[in-house]
């Protein structure tokens, strides 16, 4: 028969055979032969492949740094990694949660709508035209442009989301 | 290596005051947001006050406000809270932060104790 050229799922093919994958939790220790089932062995104490697969290594549990203030929220398994939070108080800095923060800053463009507090983090919002933040702040809202208006003044530069307006004298050159 | 080191910490009467500090090292200080932390015995962290990087603005807690004032002097690198009024609820550890207020950089705080 005709050397297959493509698998059913959970096999691999190799070697012009379809050979079984190991199955989650296990790695690969020898390709299966026309007399053979592949062989697999399970993963080690902190280890685990969360696939079926065809590594020949397991993958290291992510290590929780107490001195990046991180604990572990859920231990792994050999089919599922480690998960890890920050301590009380603090905020992962990414869904990863590979660091935390005391709270996140909100970046020029956007105020701080809500304070962090220990179970949330800081809520930015963008500010909206009439205001701006030149800063990054975890406390600061976004501020209104000066009115040149009230000084007598004009505006000589626009303002953005991130500068405020430039006022100026008035043209007394006027018709 | 950036490193805040929180004094002034001690032991007052209800009513009393203390003037914390903060020394600043290893980053040009001026310009950053700096933040005061505490933390009560078997409570969570709470946000007390915050100054601007120019000390323009500043942040209070509800809890805080009318009793405490933030400052910072950038020619000596150093953060500051004044607290007056001080009550048996204000006993905690307090910690200055600073952006990106990474973990670590944390100091080892100063205990303040409000006990008659």
């Known amino acids: 028969p005709e050397p297959p050229t493509a698998c059913r799922e959970k096999q691999y093919l190799i070697n012009s055979q379809c050979c079984s994958l190991c199955q989650p939790g296990q790695k690969l220790v020898s390709d299966c032969t026309e007399f053979t089932e592949t062989e697999c062995l399970p993963c080690g104490e902190s280890e685990f492949l969360d696939t079926w697969n065809r590594e020949t290594h397991c993958h290291q549990h992510k290590y929780c740094d107490p001195n990046l203030g991180l604990r572990v929220q859920q231990k792994g398994t050999s089919e599922t990694d480690t998960i890890c939070t920050c301590e009380e108080g603090w905020h992962c800095t990414s869904e990863a949660c590979e660091s935390c923060v005391l709270h996140r800053s909100c970046s020029p463009g956007f105020g701080v709508k809500q304070i962090a507090t220990g179970v949330s983090d800081t809520i930015c919002e963008p500010c909206p035209v009439g205001f701006f933040s030149n800063v990054s702040s975890a406390f600061e809202k976004c501020h209104p442009w000066t009115s040149c208006e009230t000084k007598d003044l004009v505006v000589q530069q626009a303002g953005t989301n991130k500068t405020d307006v430039v006022c100026g004298p008035q043209d007394r050159l006027r018709a | 290596e950036v490193q805040l080191l929180e004094s002034g910490g001690g032991l007052v009467q209800p009513g009393g005051s203390l003037r914390l500090s903060c020394a600043a090292s290893?980053?040009?200080?001026?310009?950053?947001e700096m933040w005061w932390v505490r933390q009560a015995p078997g409570k969570g962290l709470e946000r007390v006050s915050?100054?601007?990087?120019?000390?323009?603005?500043?942040y209070y807690a509800d809890s805080v406000k009318g009793r405490f004032t933030i400052t910072r002097d950038d020619s000596k690198n150093t953060l500051y809270l004044q607290m007056n009024s001080l009550r048996a609820e204000d006993t905690a550890v307090y910690y200055c932060?600073?952006?990106?207020?990474?973990?670590?950089?944390w100091g080892q705080g100063t205990l303040v104790t409000v006990s008659s």
């Open positions: 932060a600073k952006e990106p207020y990474s973990f670590d950089y």
């Open positions: 915050a100054i601007s990087g120019s000390g323009g603005s500043t």
């Open positions: 290893g980053f040009t200080f001026a310009g950053y």
